[in-house]
C-alpha cells in the first residue's frame, strides 16, 4: 500500500495515526472521528490544550495517546463526550498538573503521565493517591515532579476535600411550613458548590440563597412528601468533591389501610401505615387486644428508602374458624390516630361445632417484621372451604 | 438448611440461673419465624418454655413466666434463655427450635441443676 | 384446662395401622402438631396444621381431627417407626403452646 501523505492516517479498522511532525494543532474535524476507538497522537508540538470541543463526536473511543508533543493543559470536563475511555496515555509533554476533574466519571485501567514536568501540589493528591492505591499502572511509573522529587513524597497533610456542614431546624416541622437550610463550607482553594436537590420533585418550592462559604436554600410550603428525601450539600476544590445529604422529618399524622385477607404459603391480612413519625401499631380482635405469637403476628415489608409508608401483613399461619372475626388495625402517632377494620373469615369449624365450647380469643403487639417461614411441605393439602367476608 | 445449636453451662447451683444460647445458621434470625425454647426432663415428655420474634415479641409459658426471660441478638443470630430461681425440677435436656411447627430443632443440651 | 392427653404405650404388629391419639379442649379449636422422637435425638416434626407433611416425611404418616381429639395415623409401620410421639397445639387462650405427655409406640 502506498504510504499516506495526511497528517492523520486509518490504522487497522477503527484506528488512527498522527505522527507527521507539527501537523496539528487540534483535534477538530479528524476523519472517521464516530467510530474510532483507537487515537494515536505523536510529535504535534502545537497542540497544546485539550478541551471538550475536541473529543466532540468521538464516543466510541477507549485509548487515547498524546505523546511528545506539546500539551500543557487538559480541561477538566476534556473527556466529557468519551465515557468509553479505558487507555489514556499522555507522556511527555509539558503537563504540569492534571485536574482530578478530567478522569471522574472514567474507567481508566491505564494512565500514563511520565516524562511530564508535574507540579507537586495539592492538585495531584488525587494522583498520589492512585499511586498508593496501585491504580492505572501509576506506580509503575515512579512520577517525578519537575525540580521537587518524587510525587509519592509529595507532603499532603493539608490537601483535603471541602468540608461540609448542613444545618437542620431541631424543632418538628409541619407541612406547610417554610424551612431553611444552610451548608458551611470550609477547606482551602474552594471552587465550586451547590445543591442537589433532583429527589425534592413536588415536595417544597425551592429558592436559594447566599454563595461560598455558607450556601441558603430555603424549602417553602413543604409537604410530607419530604420525608426520605435526600436534600445533598456539595463543594468542590483542586483536591476533589465533598458531599453532605440530610433529611427534613416533616411531621404528619398516622394514616391506616387494610385489605382483604389473602391466602398465600399461610394468610395474610395486608395492610399500610403511614406517618411521621412512624406511628405505633396495635392490632384488635373482636375489640379486644390481638396478643401476637408465632401463629398471628405482623410482619412489614421491606421499605421503601425514599418514603415514610409502611406495608405489611397480619400473619396468620394456619389459622381455624376461631381466628373467624373482625380485625382492627390502630396507628397512633403524637399527630394523631387512626384505624381500619375488616371482617375476615377463614374457615368453617372443621372440628366439629359445639355451641358449650368457649371461644378462645388471642389476648399487645409491638409491631413487627419480615420473610420466610413453613416447614417445606411433601404434599400440599387445599384448606377447609374458605371465604373472605369485607366489613 | 436451617441449622440450630444450644450451648451453656451443663452444671448449674440451686437457686442460680441457668443461662442458655442458641446459635442459628443457614438463615437468618430475622426472618419471619419465631424462636422457641422446649425442655425435657429425664425420661419424661416435652414442655415449651417460651417464643420469641426478631422484633421483640415474646410470649411464655404460664407456670414458668416469672422465672423466664427470652432475648436474641441479631448481630449474632442468636437467641437466649435465662431461668432464675433454678431447683432440681429444672434438671432436663433443653432445645431449641424454629416456631411455630418447631419443624427445626438443636440437638439439645442436658443442664443438670446441682450443688 | 391447658393439657394434651395421649395414651402412654402402644403397640402395632409391622405392616398394620396404627392410631395415636391426643385429647384436649383446644384442640376443638386448633389444629395439632405431632412430633417422633428416638432415643437420645432432638423430636422430629411429621405432621402440622390440617394433614400437612414436612418434606422427607414418609406419606404413611397422615393426620386428622374431630371435636376434641386429633390423631396421628401411621398406614403400615415400619420397624424404624418405633419411637415416642407427642401432640402439641396452642392452648385454649391461644397465647401459648402446650405438649402432650407423649405415647411410646412399639413395633411389634
Known amino acids: 500500500a502506498a504510504p499516506c501523505p495526511d497528517a492523520c492516517c486509518p490504522h487497522g479498522s477503527s484506528g488512527l495515526r498522527c505522527t507527521r511532525d507539527g501537523a496539528l494543532d487540534s483535534l477538530h474535524h479528524l476523519p472517521g472521528a464516530e467510530n474510532l476507538t483507537e487515537l494515536y497522537i505523536e510529535n504535534q508540538q502545537h497542540l497544546q490544550h485539550l478541551e471538550l470541543r475536541d473529543l466532540r463526536g468521538l464516543g466510541e473511543l477507549r485509548n487515547l495517546t498524546i505523546v511528545k508533543s506539546g500539551l500543557r493543559f487538559v480541561a477538566p470536563d476534556a473527556f466529557h463526550f468519551t465515557p468509553r475511555l479505558s487507555r489514556l496515555n499522555l507522556s511527555f509533554n509539558a503537563l504540569e498538573s492534571l485536574s482530578w476533574k478530567t478522569v471522574q466519571g472514567l474507567s481508566l485501567q491505564e494512565l500514563v503521565l511520565s516524562g511530564n514536568p508535574l507540579h507537586c501540589s495539592c492538585a495531584l493528591r488525587w494522583l498520589q493517591r492512585w499511586e498508593e492505591e496501585g491504580l492505572g499502572g501509576v506506580p509503575e511509573q515512579k512520577l517525578q515532579c519537575h525540580g521537587q522529587g518524587p510525587l509519592a513524597h509529595m507532603p499532603n497533610a493539608s490537601c483535603g476535600v471541602p468540608t461540609l456542614k448542613v444545618q437542620v431546624p431541631n424543632a418538628s416541622v409541619d407541612v406547610g411550613d417554610d424551612v431553611l437550610l444552610r451548608c458551611q463550607v470550609e477547606g482551602r482553594g474552594l471552587e465550586q458548590a451547590g445543591w442537589i436537590l433532583t429527589e425534592l420533585e413536588q415536595s417544597a418550592t425551592v429558592m436559594k440563597s447566599g454563595g461560598l462559604p455558607s450556601l441558603g436554600l430555603t424549602l417553602a410550603n413543604v409537604t410530607s412528601d419530604l420525608n426520605r428525601k435526600n436534600v445533598t450539600c456539595w463543594a468542590e476544590n483542586d483536591v476533589g468533591r465533598a458531599e453532605v445529604s440530610v433529611q427534613v422529618n416533616v411531621s404528619f399524622p398516622a394514616s391506616v389501610q387494610l385489605h382483604t385477607a389473602v391466602e398465600m404459603h399461610h394468610w395474610c391480612i395486608p395492610f399500610s401505615v403511614d406517618g411521621q413519625p412512624a406511628p405505633s401499631l396495635r392490632w384488635l380482635f373482636n375489640g379486644s387486644v390481638l396478643n401476637e405469637t408465632s401463629f398471628i403476628f405482623t410482619e412489614f415489608l421491606e421499605p421503601a428508602a425514599n418514603e415514610t409508608v409502611r406495608h405489611g401483613c397480619l400473619r396468620l399461619n394456619q389459622p381455624t374458624h376461631v381466628n373467624n372475626g373482625n380485625y382492627t388495625l390502630l396507628a397512633a402517632n403524637p399527630f394523631g390516630q387512626a384505624s381500619a377494620s375488616i371482617m375476615a373469615a377463614f374457615m368453617d369449624n372443621p372440628f366439629e361445632f359445639n355451641p358449650e365450647d368457649p371461644i378462645p380469643v388471642s389476648f399487645s403487639p409491638v409491631d413487627t417484621n419480615s420473610t420466610s417461614g413453613d416447614p417445606v411441605e411433601k404434599k400440599d393439602e387445599t384448606p377447609f372451604g374458605v371465604s373472605v367476608a369485607v366489613g | 438448611e436451617v441449622q440450630l445449636q444450644e450451648s451453656g453451662p451443663g452444671l448449674v447451683k440451686p437457686s442460680g440461673t441457668l443461662s442458655l444460647t442458641c446459635a442459628v445458621s443457614g438463615g437468618s434470625i430475622s426472618s419471619s419465624n419465631w424462636w422457641t425454647w422446649v425442655r425435657q426432663p429425664p425420661g419424661k415428655g416435652l414442655e415449651w418454655i417460651g417464643e420469641?420474634?426478631?422484633?421483640?415479641?415474646?410470649n411464655y409459658n404460664p407456670s414458668l413466666k416469672s422465672r423466664v426471660t427470652i432475648s436474641v441478638d441479631k448481630s449474632k443470630n442468636q437467641f437466649s434463655l435465662k431461668l432464675s430461681s433454678v431447683t432440681a425440677a429444672d434438671t432436663a435436656v433443653y432445645y431449641c427450635a424454629r416456631a411455630p411447627w418447631f419443624d427445626y430443632w438443636g440437638q439439645g443440651t442436658l443442664v443438670t441443676v446441682s450443688s | 384446662s391447658s393439657e394434651l392427653t395421649q395414651d402412654p404405650a402402644v403397640s402395632v404388629a409391622l405392616g398394620q395401622t396404627v392410631r395415636i391419639t391426643c385429647q384436649g379442649l383446644?384442640?376443638?379449636?386448633?389444629?395439632a402438631s405431632w412430633y417422633q422422637q428416638k432415643p437420645g435425638q432432638a423430636p422430629v416434626l411429621v405432621i402440622y396444621g390440617k394433614n400437612k407433611r414436612p418434606s422427607g416425611i414418609p406419606d404413611r404418616f397422615s393426620g386428622s381431627s374431630s371435636g376434641n381429639t386429633a390423631s396421628l395415623t401411621i398406614t403400615g409401620a415400619q420397624a424404624e417407626d418405633e419411637a415416642d410421639y407427642y401432640c402439641n397445639s396452642q392452648a385454649s387462650s391461644g397465647n401459648h403452646l402446650i405438649f402432650g405427655g407423649g405415647t411410646k409406640l412399639t413395633v411389634l
Open positions: 383446644s384442640l376443638r379449636s386448633y389444629y
Open positions: 420469641i420474634y426478631h422484633r421483640g415479641n415474646r
